[in-house]
Amino acid sequence: MMTGTIETTGNISAEKGGSIILQCHLSSTTAQVTQVNWEQQDQLLAICNADLGWHISPSFKDRVAPGPGLGLTLQSLTVNDTGEYFCIYHTYPDGTYTGRIFLEVLESSVAEHGARFQIP
């Protein structure tokens, strides 16, 4: 039985040109995390494998930095980065847990006055 739950940073906003940390936290399970996939809609951003470390998709290599921990840092944000992001935790023996984050990238002045849930 899958007992775990995923907490995420939820809905977040950041300003164009800035950076943001995407984080998910798996709790309430003793299952071993074997791999975490980060995806944007249906596009793979990065994989963090317990035995092989990080793999960043070539198309994102210049704008994505792994960490902290199993999180992912997006840099040089553009308005095209607005959208849904998913953390997919592969665990043993539980199976797969998925968390969702919605990121809105705003023009600088808008983000300054209207940003909620922003990670510094």
Partner: antibody, heavy 117, light 107 residues
Framework: EVQLQQSGTVLARPGASVKMSCKTS????????MHWVKQRPGQGLEWIGA????????RYNQKFKGKAKLTAVTSANTAYMELSSLTNEDSAVYYC??????????WGQGTSVTVSS | DIVLTQSPATLSVTPGDSVSLSCRAS??????LHWYQQNSHESPRLLIK???QSISGIPSRFSGSGSGTDFTLSINSVETEDFGLYFC?????????FGGGTRLEIN
């Protein structure tokens, strides 16, 4: 077997700079953060910073900005840390350690630095 | 920066005893907490990752628990090779930080 081999003991004068190395083997160097940790005699562990050789991203403890500079040469599977403007406070053992998102799972044997006039 | 406070600073025990070491974070770090052991004149060694996940090659007498701000490393029936220093470390946010350590010594 994963190995992190650090350079040998260093004796340096106050005001000088030292550059130590951490040569890795048997894993994909560009897939893991390389962390550097300071330990003064009889003391705890202090995180200095980390570099991700995959794209040269670096993160620093604010306390060590301007003191430590982290670099990595992927062709040699080797990470480096340079310490500048040395003082007695910099006398310590410095460890390199890799992290692939699941804790600092492998550590070097440490490089001992002694600053003395 | 996140501050990790370990207690007690020193713990004197007899081989065969079971012990608990505490690590408290200054703010919630979810389960992003790892435990290390350091024996005299050796490099640290990863014992537990993400608060409770076991590490290959580490004896099963070591276990971890906790979430949020309060974490515990338990050693069930201490053996002589377990004496040394124990550190917790968080990977919730940059900069990573370590606790001040707990020294486990023979009573």
């Amino acid at each position: 077997e994963v190995q992190l081999q650090q350079s040998g003991t260093v004796l340096a004068r106050p005001g000088a700079s030292v550059k130590m190395s951490c040569k890795t083997s048997d894993y994909s160097f560009t897939s893991y953060w390389m962390h550097w940790v300071k330990q003064r005699p009889g003391q705890g562990l202090e995180w200095i910073g980390a570099i991700y050789p995959g794209n040269s991203a670096a993160r620093y403890n604010q306390k060590f900005k301007g003191k430590a500079k982290l670099t990595a040469v992927t062709s040699a599977n080797t990470a480096y840390m340079e310490l500048s403007s040395l003082t007695n406070e910099d006398s310590a053992v410095y460890y390199c350690s890799r992290e692939g998102g699941y804790g600092l799972d492998y550590w070097g044997q440490g490089t001992s630095v002694t600053v003395s006039s | 920066d996140i501050v990790l406070t370990q207690s007690p600073a020193t713990l004197s025990v007899t081989p065969g005893d079971s012990v608990s070491l505490s690590c408290r974070a200054s703010q919630s770090i979810y389960n992003n907490l790892h435990w290390y052991q350091q024996n005299s004149h050796e490099s640290p060694r990863l014992l537990i990752k993400y608060a409770s996940q076991s590490i290959s090659g580490i004896p099963s007498r070591f276990s971890g628990s906790g979430s949020g701000t309060d974490f515990t490393l338990s050693i069930n029936s201490v053996e002589t090779e377990d004496f040394g220093l124990y550190f917790c470390q968080q990977s919730n946010s940059w900069p990573y930080t370590f606790g001040g350590g707990t020294r486990l010594e023979i009573n």
